[in-house]
């Protein structure tokens, strides 16, 4: 069974792989940044495990993570963002395993937001734009976005634009006539920091006009 | 095997400007956190400015805030201190630090000194 013995014998404890991923996220209430950790292995027995954050604080030498259900957290202004901190899965005074990180390199941006697509008659084309929160912040403002759409009745058919704007446009040629699209955005940092893709922004749906059957566009 | 080098220490009048240099051999240098320290005489080695990895990032002690500038060019594997309106108490031997790994800095330099004469 995972997790340590509840007599203090640390030794099935130590058969256990405690291996897990942390990311941040800067400046995601308003100065406040937050870290997050879980266990690679979502059947670890997380009972009596704490993480811990060391070195690279401002005023601190160390800080405890919350625990809200599977996942270990952090809101806090304490980080320093300069160098290698130490975080460790303990039980009690007794660290498990632990990872050197710099937390400006695991950063996870915060998803994307007010996607929105105009269809442009006279242009023959539809303007995709969104925002992200990003923009108004002090360190993680420059991102890379994936702008993903699909017919809705393609599965698994995805087209991926990657842009570093918030606003793209979309030839009505190069999409099917009469068609139900769907549409999403994501973000990852790009240029000074680095880490992971952010949640996906909530999907957009428009609908491309018939063809015309007179001049073979689309109305 | 020298693996920090500073450079640009020198005789300056207070009010005066200094850059100082400092070329790291280290092969993680991109990566690095790179600080700057100073010892005046008689003192002991204090905390002056630190760079995170990229630049994007920087931190300066209050003693310094607002003359001084932390910058660095990871294409030269070189960290830089624009040190402006330089006064008598900035006087001191000027050392340059890599790789802040929890709260400890594994790599210091020989330092290159600096004095600001009234």
């Known amino acids: 069974e995972s997790g340590y013995a509840q007599n203090g014998d640390l030794e099935d404890a130590e058969l256990d792989d405690y291996s897990f991923s942390c990311y941040s996220q800067l400046e995601v209430n308003g100065s406040q940044h937050s870290l997050t950790c879980a266990f690679e292995d979502p059947d670890v027995n997380t009972t009596n495990l704490e993480f811990e954050i060391c070195g690279a604080l401002v005023e601190v030498k160390c800080l405890n993570f919350r625990k809200l259900q599977e996942i270990y957290f952090i809101e806090t202004k304490k980080f320093l963002l300069i160098g290698k901190s130490n975080i460790c899965v303990k039980v009690g005074e007794k660290s498990l395993t632990c990872k050197k990180i710099d937390l400006t390199t695991i950063v996870k941006p915060e998803a994307p937001f007010d996607l929105s697509v105009i269809y442009r008659e006279g242009a023959n084309d539809f303007v995709v734009t969104f925002n992200t929160s990003h923009l108004q912040k002090k360190y993680v403002k420059v991102l890379m976005h994936d702008v993903a759409y699909r017919q809705e009745k393609d599965e698994n058919k995805w087209t991926h634009v990657n842009l570093s704007s918030t606003k793209l446009t979309l030839l009505q040629r190069k999409l099917q006539p009469a068609a139900m699209y769907e549409i999403k955005v994501r973000s990852i940092p790009d240029h000074y920091f680095k880490g992971f893709w952010s949640e996906w922004s909530p999907s957009y749906y428009f609908r491309t006009p018939e063809i015309n059957n007179s001049s073979g566009e689309m109305d | 095997e020298v693996q920090l080098v500073e450079s640009g220490g020198g005789l300056v009048q207070a009010g005066g400007s200094l850059r100082l240099s400092c070329e790291s051999s280290?092969?993680?240098?991109?990566?690095?956190?790179m600080g700057w320290f100073r010892q005046a005489p008689g003192k002991e080695r204090e905390f002056l400015a630190a760079?995170?990895?990229?630049?994007?990032?920087?931190h300066y002690s209050d003693s310094v805030q607002g003359r001084f500038t932390i910058s660095r060019d990871n294409a030269k594997n070189t960290v830089y201190l624009q040190m402006n309106s330089l006064k008598s108490e900035d006087t001191g031997r000027y050392y340059c630090?890599?790789?802040?790994?929890?709260?400890?800095?594994?790599?210091w330099g020989q330092g290159t000194l600096v004095t600001v004469s009234s």
């Open positions: 280290i092969s993680t240098f991109s990566s690095d956190a």
């Open positions: 630090a890599e790789d802040y790994d929890t709260d400890v800095w594994q790599y």
């Open positions: 760079i995170g990895w990229s630049g994007a990032v920087t």
